[in-house]
């Protein structure tokens, strides 16, 4: 979900935005800081083994409105939050995994202890 309000079409920021990046740092990042004309994000999702993994970084303006909308994906537990209000604003984003649905237990992978 977007933390700073929805807009119908993304408008270009007058200045570059710096974001914290983790597991999602582009080549042009330095010291785990990336730069963008769009949004900072933090995302939590389950990996193949069902372990929650947190990633953060930069989303370019192109397509970021769609990516920040956090549309549910079947059989994939994932949540993303985006922000633009200040540099490294995504340090303070803490998305949580959506609750498991009954169907997820049936359709999802079976984990053996």
């Amino acid at each position: 979900k977007k933390e700073d309000g929805e807009s119908t079409a993304p408008t270009a920021r007058p200045k570059v935005l710096r974001c914290k990046c983790h597991h999602h740092c582009p080549e042009d990042s330095v010291n785990n800081i990336c730069s963008t004309d769009g949004y900072c994000f933090t995302m939590i999702e389950e990996d193949d083994s069902g372990t929650p993994v947190v990633t953060s970084g930069c989303l370019g303006l192109e397509g970021s409105d769609f990516q920040c909308r956090d549309t549910p994906i079947p059989h994939q537990r994932r949540s993303i939050e985006c922000c633009t209000e200040r540099n490294e604003c995504n340090k303070d984003l803490h998305p949580t995994l959506p609750p498991l649905k009954d169907r997820d237990f049936v359709d999802g992978p079976i984990h053996h202890k």
């Epitope: 007058p14 200045k15 042009d28 800081i33 004309d37 769009g38 192109e62 540099n87 490294e88």
Partner: antibody, heavy 116, light 112 residues
Framework: QVQLQQPGAELVKPGASVKLSCKAS????????MQWVKQRPGQGLEWIGE????????LYNQKFKGKATLTVDTSSSTAYMQLSSLTSEDSAVYYC?????????WGLGTTLTVSS | DVVMTQTPLSLPVSLGDQASIFCRSS???????????LHWYLQKPGQSPKLLIY???NRFSGVPDRFSGSGSGTDFTLKISRVEAEDLGVYFC?????????FGSGTKLEIK
Amino acid sequence: QVQLQQPGAELVKPGASVKLSCKASGYTFTSYWMQWVKQRPGQGLEWIGEIDPSDNYTLYNQKFKGKATLTVDTSSSTAYMQLSSLTSEDSAVYYCARFGYYVDYWGLGTTLTVSS
Amino acid sequence: DVVMTQTPLSLPVSLGDQASIFCRSSQSLVHSTGNTYLHWYLQKPGQSPKLLIYKVSNRFSGVPDRFSGSGSGTDFTLKISRVEAEDLGVYFCSQSTHVPFTFGSGTKLEIK
């Protein structure tokens, strides 16, 4: 129109510190980063660092970490760069420059002379 | 740091001639957003630099259309189609893709 006003010259002694100023007008100060660039006579331009006046966030060139400190006063739309432990190597013209995704406007520069 | 290599260092021209200045970066200047942050500035004696071209090929406001920029990746060119007296000075390329931002060493455009 966008203007970045800098004092023309500063003369300081070796070992001392100096605080250079850059007063911005003609635009919303917090909507752009402010960068500082060094130019020595006959040499190229060197990027020192930048500050975002909206949240005081700074990025420095490693080479100038510990030498330069960038600050802003949003009430007067003024950016500052403090240079410490000055030596003759710090004698140069220092420019402030407005930055969005590229520098579009430069100050006229302050000529810093470090001499006893 | 990204090294910006400019050629030639000096460019003697006759007024009305075409002039080309080249800039090569030590790594690609294509940013992760897809933009290429390569820019050109002109510095006249005793003045601060002035922006001519931003993001490879976009003329800044008030810049005459005899100035044009081109290139991609690591190789870029600034062309002046018909040199005028007011064009004389030192031209710098600059990149703002990678921190620290860096500049070319400059090309001095002078009368032949």
